[in-house]
């Protein structure tokens, strides 16, 4: 049997016997195009593809569109994976989307969607999500029903403001709604009461700004 | 540092009046909603009244109409809410919070209160015989 050599997802790297966490080398489906991206092979069972992650504030993640639909920052640290990539993956077979919240405080707490999917570009990567568990909320912090993708340069949102120039960051903005992962990045002891930080409110609350976040898929069938 | 700081609460007997003050630091009231809620031992906080400085638009809860004023001094970045006539089922800790004006749904009034990201620490208000 001929080894595989092309990777869709992290999950495919894990089953085939790469079972350490770090970055692979990923394909677009029925491309050849390539995409370097953090595979999480320890939590819940591994197999994770990690598609953003917040630690530090060392990342600018106040982007343009095209650095959003492309991708940017280090898998190793702050990242963000791409939405053409993302839409693509999770247009072919069904994902589920987990998604890991760290406070100030030393908590922990995830929120997870057993169906996730980004539209495509031509409709803003509109973000679909559907059965939510998990301990950050038991109300879903990203609305719904799910928003189009806003960014500094695309005003996708259902504001009478820009939601990404005024909260910063590009995201899921409903008007602007009760979440904002990509927002900007508060030091301790700075992080409350604040209008634009790390949002994730069915957890935290209003104006908490968290210190960690990682959001990952996997196919619902691993 | 964006700041919220209520006053103005204490005990008061059924019928009695109250004003609380909400001053408000590290941003200008002529950007900002500032919304009052209240939460009573139990309860879900709720919304109360509301102001939009910059275009003097108010909002109040069914059940706070024509007994609650809410105002705003610009020059001193304060809000106050009058309560008059108050009533034992008024007993809660009052909040004031402030959201940007225009993070605001086409077509809506007001705003939903995870909108609200600035809160102050609230203020008793006990209303007793």
């Known amino acids: 049997k001929e080894e595989q050599t092309t990777f869709r997802d992290c999950a495919e790297i894990f089953k085939s016997g790469l079972t350490t966490s770090g970055i692979y080398t990923l394909t677009f489906p029925n491309s050849t195009e390539e995409i370097k991206a953090y595979c999480d092979m320890d939590v819940g069972g591994g197999g994770w593809t990690v598609i953003q992650h917040r630690e530090d504030g060392s990342v600018d993640f106040q982007r343009t569109w095209k650095e959003y639909k492309e991708g940017f920052g280090s898998p190793l640290g702050e990242y963000w994976l791409g939405n053409e990539f993302v839409s693509q993956l999770t247009g072919q077979h069904r994902y589920v989307l987990k998604i890991q919240l760290k406070d100030w405080e030393g908590n922990e707490a995830h929120s997870l969607y057993d169906h996730f999917y980004l539209a495509g570009e031509e409709s803003n990567y509109r973000i679909h999500l559907t059965g939510l568990t998990g301990t950050a909320g038991k109300i879903s912090s990203i609305s719904q029903p799910g928003s189009d993708f806003s960014t500094k340069d695309s005003d996708n949102d259902k504001c009478i403001c820009k939601c990404s120039q005024m909260l910063s960051g590009g995201w899921w903005f409903d008007a602007c709604g009760p979440s904002n992962l990509n927002g900007q990045y508060y030091p301790q002891k700075q992080n409350t009461n604040k209008f634009n930080g790390i949002k994730w409110y069915y957890w935290k609350g209003s104006g908490y700004s968290l210190k960690a976040t990682t959001m990952m898929i996997r196919p619902a069938d691993f | 540092e964006v700041q919220l700081v209520e006053s103005g609460g204490g005990l008061v007997q059924p019928g009695g009046s109250l004003r609380l003050s909400c001053a408000a630091s590290?941003?200008?009231?002529?950007?900002?909603?500032i919304g009052w809620f209240r939460q009573a031992p139990g309860k879900e906080r709720e919304g109360v009244s509301a102001?939009?400085?910059?275009?003097?638009?108010?909002y109040y809860a069914d059940s706070v109409k024509g007994r609650f004023t809410i105002s705003s001094d610009n020059s001193k970045n304060t809000v106050y809410l009058q309560m008059n006539s108050l009533r034992p089922e008024d007993t809660a800790v009052y909040y004031c919070?402030?959201?940007?004006?225009?993070?605001?749904?086409?077509?809506?009034?007001?705003?939903?209160?995870?909108?609200?990201?600035?809160w102050g620490q609230g203020t008793l208000v006990t209303v007793s015989s």
């Open positions: 102001i939009r400085s910059s275009g003097g638009s108010t």
């Open positions: 919070a402030a959201v940007p004006a225009g993070r605001l749904r086409f077509g809506e009034q007001w705003y939903p209160l995870y909108e609200y990201d600035a």
């Open positions: 590290g941003f200008t009231l002529d950007d900002y909603a």
